[in-house]
């Protein structure tokens, strides 16, 4: 969508304006995070055979990972900018607990996992500035998140490896869907 003059457009000669429009910045930020996820997935797939496993359904039952659905207004059919933006922000906020879980799951990529977490927080801030209807965004309950984290960390090794793989795969898919939707806004 075109940027209204004086907001974030490149032709505004403000002394300290951002070097990118907000839409460009969001697009690049998502791809930056996807780049980080692919580095983490590489370690996960090298370390275990989870990436080829057919037993994903077993672990998926423990998880309630955000997914795009038709009603969210992010797909081409039935596209709704405001509903979709709320879904993207809500979904990212819901992913935060899972990104926190990833923090202790990597030996050689500890900082990489932190990088994905931190760049996601920045993305949420960018998107919140774009959203008009912030009241519609529900923030996850911290107590619920804390007990979910405890539950995930108490799983056996196989389930923890599978959970890590599923989080990364789902987060990648969610970001890719978000990217496609945001390019229509």
């Amino acid at each position: 969508a075109p940027v209204p003059p004086g907001e974030d457009s490149k032709d505004v000669a403000a002394p300290h304006r951002q070097p990118l429009t907000s839409s460009e910045r969001i697009d690049k930020q998502i791809r930056y995070i996807l780049d980080g996820i692919s580095a983490l997935r590489k370690e996960t797939c090298n370390k275990s055979n989870m990436c080829e496993s057919s037993k994903e359904a077993l672990a998926e039952n423990n998880l309630n990972l955000p997914k795009m659905a038709e009603k969210d207004g992010c797909f081409q059919s039935g596209f709704n900018e405001e509903t979709c933006l709320v879904k993207i922000i809500t979904g990212l906020l819901e992913f935060e607990v899972y990104l926190e879980y990833l923090q202790n799951r990597f030996e050689s990529s500890e900082e990489q996992a932190r990088a994905v977490q931190m760049s996601t927080k920045v993305l949420i801030q960018f998107l919140q500035k774009k959203a008009k209807n912030l009241d519609a965004i529900t923030t996850p309950d911290p107590t619920t998140n804390a007990s979910l984290l405890t539950k995930l960390q108490a799983q056996n090794q196989w389930l923890q490896d599978m959970t890590t793989h599923l989080i990364l795969r789902s987060f990648k898919e969610f970001l890719q869907s978000s990217l496609r939707a945001l390019r229509q806004m």
Epitope: Q18, P19, L20, R25, K28, Q29, R31, Y32, I33, D35, G36, S38, A39, S108, S109, E110, E111, Q112, R114, A115, M118, S119, K121, V122, L123
Partner: nanobody, 129 residues
């Protein structure tokens, strides 16, 4: 732990050139963002330029951004073999005189100093008229 060390500062004539270097060690993550900032006495740090780096060849890799005041005069680049990010400063002006810092973050497309996590100790640039 990530460490950044700047070098290449010094005295230059107006209209002259300097090349600043920032050696990065201890980085274990990708993608990453490196920025150059300048600070004049008694003033706040100002963003100068940014480059995005990645260990994978994506189209984000090597993405560069410049403050209006230096665009067309300064060039930011990186040399992965030497873990170095350079700032080539041409057509220098007296108002470019400042301490120049390089900084690193993995937060993405950020351009303000409070969003950077690791900092070098700075190198002084003085431009005489």
């Amino acid at each position: 732990q990530v460490q950044l060390v700047e070098s290449g500062g010094g005295l230059a004539q107006a209209g002259g050139s300097l090349r600043l270097s920032c050696v990065v060690s201890g980085r274990t993550f990708s993608p990453y963002t490196i920025g150059w900032f300048s600070q004049r006495p008694g003033k706040e740090r100002e963003w100068v330029a940014t480059i995005i780096g990645s260990d994978r060849s994506t189209d984000l890799d090597g993405d560069t951004y410049y403050a209006d005041s230096v665009r067309g005069r300064f060039t930011i680049s990186r040399n992965d073999a030497k873990n170095t990010v350079s700032l080539q400063m041409n057509s220098l002006k007296p108002e470019d005189s400042a301490v120049y810092y390089c900084a690193l973050t993995a937060k993405g497309y950020v351009f303000t100093d409070n969003e950077y996590d690791y900092w070098g100790q700075g190198t002084q640039v003085t431009v005489s008229s």
